[in-house]
C-alpha cells in the first residue's frame, strides 16, 4: 500500500554556527571553539 501524505517527522532549526580562536597565553597555545546558538560546544 502507498503511504498517505504526511509531513516529515522532524523540524529543521536554522542556527548560526560561529568558529572562534582565542589566544590564552604563549605557553598554552590556542583554544578553538564552536558556538551553537550562544553555547560553546567544542
Amino acid at each position: 500500500d502507498a503511504e498517505f501524505r504526511h509531513d516529515s517527522g522532524y523540524e529543521v532549526h536554522h542556527q548560526k554556527l560561529v568558529f572562534f580562536a582565542e589566544d590564552v597565553g604563549s605557553n598554552k597555545g590556542a583554544i578553538i571553539g564552536l558556538m551553537v546558538g550562544g553555547v560553546v560546544i567544542a
Partner: antibody, heavy 123, light 112 residues
Framework: QVTLKESGPALVKPTQTLTLTCTFS??????????VGWIRQPPGKALEWLAH???????SYNPSLKSRLTISKDTSKNQVVLTMTNMDPVDTATYYC???????????????WGQGTTVTVSS | DVVMTQSPLSLPVTPGEPASISCRSS???????????LEWYLQKPGQSPQLLIY???NRFSGVPDRFSGSGSGTDFTLKISRVEAEDVGVYYC?????????FGQGTKLEIK
Amino acid sequence: QVTLKESGPALVKPTQTLTLTCTFSGFSLSTSGMGVGWIRQPPGKALEWLAHIWWDDDKSYNPSLKSRLTISKDTSKNQVVLTMTNMDPVDTATYYCARRQLGLRSIDAMDYWGQGTTVTVSS
Amino acid sequence: DVVMTQSPLSLPVTPGEPASISCRSSQSILHSNGNTYLEWYLQKPGQSPQLLIYKVSNRFSGVPDRFSGSGSGTDFTLKISRVEAEDVGVYYCFQATRVPLTFGQGTKLEIK
C-alpha cells in the same frame, strides 16, 4: 470557529451519479497543509474512508472506489465536492466530510467533522 | 489494505470503573517519517464521530485526561481510567499511514 456541513440529495436512483458538497468555514483551503476528506457510514455499520484533497490539489482515493470517485475543491467558495458514479443500493449511507491539516505544529488528524448527510439509493 | 481489528466489540462498564479497548493492525503502521498515525474516534449516539486521540497517545484539545492511548507497531490500546455516563457510544480506531485509510469495526461502550 471551524464548521463543516455536507449537502446533497437524500435519494438517488441506482446507476445515477451522486454529487455531495462540503461547505466549510473557520479555515481556508488556500492555507498550506490544509485538507478535507470524505468518510461514509452505512446504516448500523462501521466508517469507511473515501477520499481526501489537499490545499495544493493533491488527491488521495480509496482504491476500491477510485474508478467511481472524483474529489475537487472551490477555494473561493470554501467548498469541496465529491462525486460518485454508478450508485448502487449498497452505497446507502451517511456521508461525512472532515478536516485534516498537515504540519508539525498541526494535529494531523480529522479534528473537525460535519454533521453528515444521509443518502439513500433506491429505485 | 491494512485491516484494523478491535476487541471487544461490546463493552458493558460500570460507572467509575476502568475500560480498555484493543486495536490491532494487520501490518505495521509506522510511517516512513517516523510517526505512527493511529487515531481514536468516538461516535456518540446520533452524532458525528469526534477525535479523541491522535498519533497513538496525544489527547485532542478538550478531551478529558481519563482517556489515554498507547501502543506501537501493530498493537494499540485506548484506556478510560474511570468511565462516565457521557462516554457511551462507539469507539473506532483508525490508521492514516497507508492508503486506503482504514477504521476498525468499532467497539460499543455501554453503561451497566
